[in-house]
Interface confidence: low
């Protein structure tokens, strides 16, 4: 015998309380396939989520993120804060720690400044949270004990890098 519920189109549910009549999904619910015995509750895009597509009787709402945030996960299940240049998202918010930089807008992670000494080069321009160190040409001769003071832009003091 054919299941009478199979005749119920998307946007309805097969209502056992009404002798398996196809009843329209109540407000704020949907069924995207035929033959459903219940309608699913519409997703609500609240807070940092905003509505990209309204819920209809046959399809769920779709969310994206408010400005300053971007989607993560299947179907935009999470909104993650956009970080500016010079920042990455940490538990404490958007920032780059000393000695690291991020030159991308909205994405990316903070990477350590280039260690110029590994290539036998001097520091031509100090790094910032947004820009990497600029290394100069290779140093022809130097004393291994020489230190230079590197002060990040806007930073209160310096710290030493062994070159």
């Amino acid at each position: 015998l054919q299941d009478p519920c199979s005749n119920c189109p998307a946007g309805t549910f097969c209502d056992n309380n009404r002798n398996q009549i196809c009843s329209p999904c109540p407000p704020n619910s949907f069924s995207s396939a035929g033959g459903q015995r219940t309608c699913d509750i519409c997703r609500q895009c609240k807070g940092v989520f905003r509505t990209r597509k309204e819920c209809s009787s046959t399809s769920n709402a779709e969310c994206d993120c408010t400005p300053g945030f971007h989607c993560l996960g299947a179907g935009c299940s999470m909104c993650e804060q956009d970080c500016k240049q010079g920042q990455e998202l940490t538990k404490k918010g958007c920032k780059c720690s000393l000695g690291t930089f991020n030159d991308q807008n909205g994405t990316g992670v903070c990477r350590p400044w280039t260690n110029c000494s590994l290539d036998g080069r001097s520091v031509l321009k100090t790094g910032t949270t947004e820009k990497d160190v600029v290394c100069g040409p290779p140093v022809v001769s130097f004393s291994p004990s020489t230190t230079i003071s590197v002060t990040p832009e806007g930073g209160p003091g310096g710290h030493s890098l062994q070159v």
Epitope: Q2, S6, C8, A10, A33, G34, G35, T58
Partner: antibody, heavy 117, light 107 residues
Framework: QVQLQESGPGLVKPSETLSITCTVS????????VHWVRQPPGKGLEGLGV???????NYNSALMSRLTISKDNSKSQVSLKMSSLTAADTAMYYC???????????WGQGTTVTVSS | DIQMTQSPSSLSASLGDRVTISCSAS??????LNWYQQKPDGTVKLLIY???TLHSGVPSRFSGSGSGTDFTLTISSLQPEDVATYYC?????????FGGGTKLEIK
């Protein structure tokens, strides 16, 4: 996006049987119903009948004895057959998708059928 | 079968006018009424379902109201692209039936 396309013979002789096909793309016939509607020249819309996702049908009571609606889910096609045609069956024939809130949200562009000898 | 009667059968209005089309059912149909627009080229589109719910993409100048046996489609400010024939359709009882249509023209 969802599209419905009717195809028919154009010209049919009186007393013959009309056969029209509605091909559905972008939507499953196992999730939606398809309703047939016709419009005689210069007149209004007339519902002919519907086939539901599970395959059962409902027909316009005045035309029930002459109408058969069937479908092939695998081909995404719905067919309308109407027997014993007369000049009064000359019309534009439309198929339309039926959603669960009982409206026709997508319509085909229609196919013209002329019954004449 | 439930009979649906529309009035007027045709009307002519000026751009920017407020236009109302009436639809009457031969018996009570609660709010189970839809409105469709048929353009001169034969294209049919859903405008409003369940008496007053605007279908997606339909301009907000269209609205619907009513309950029971008497229903109204209103266009708040007539635009050139609104030239069409408008049909009401009941879905309270099978077979679903249409009104006779209202042909709307611009003066």
């Amino acid at each position: 996006q969802v599209q419905l396309q009717e195809s028919g013979p154009g010209l049919v002789k009186p007393s013959e049987t009309l056969s029209i096909t509605c091909t559905v793309s972008g939507s499953s016939l196992t999730s939606y119903g398809v309703h047939w509607v016709r419009q005689p020249p210069g007149k209004g819309l007339e519902g002919l009948g519907v086939i539901w996702p599970g395959g059962s049908t409902n027909y316009n009571s005045a035309l029930m004895s002459r109408l058969t609606i069937s479908k092939d889910n695998s081909k995404s096609q719905v067919s309308l057959k109407m027997s014993s045609l007369t000049a009064a069956d000359t019309a534009m024939y439309y198929c339309a998708r039926v959603t669960g809130t009982w409206y026709f949200d997508v319509w085909g562009q229609g196919t013209t059928v002329t019954v004449s000898s | 079968d439930i009979q649906m009667t529309q009035s007027p059968s045709s009307l002519s209005a000026s751009l920017g006018d407020r236009v109302t089309i009436s639809c009457s059912a031969s018996q009570g149909i609660s709010n189970y009424l839809n409105w469709y627009q048929q353009k001169p080229d034969g294209t049919v589109k859903l405008l409003i379902y369940y008496t007053s719910t605007l279908h997606s993409g339909v301009p907000s100048r269209f609205s619907g109201s009513g309950s029971g046996t008497d229903f109204t489609l209103t266009i708040s400010s007539l635009q050139p692209e609104d030239v069409a024939t408008y049909y009401c359709q009941q879905y309270s009882k099978l077979p679903w039936t249409f009104g006779g249509g209202t042909k709307l023209e611009i003066k």
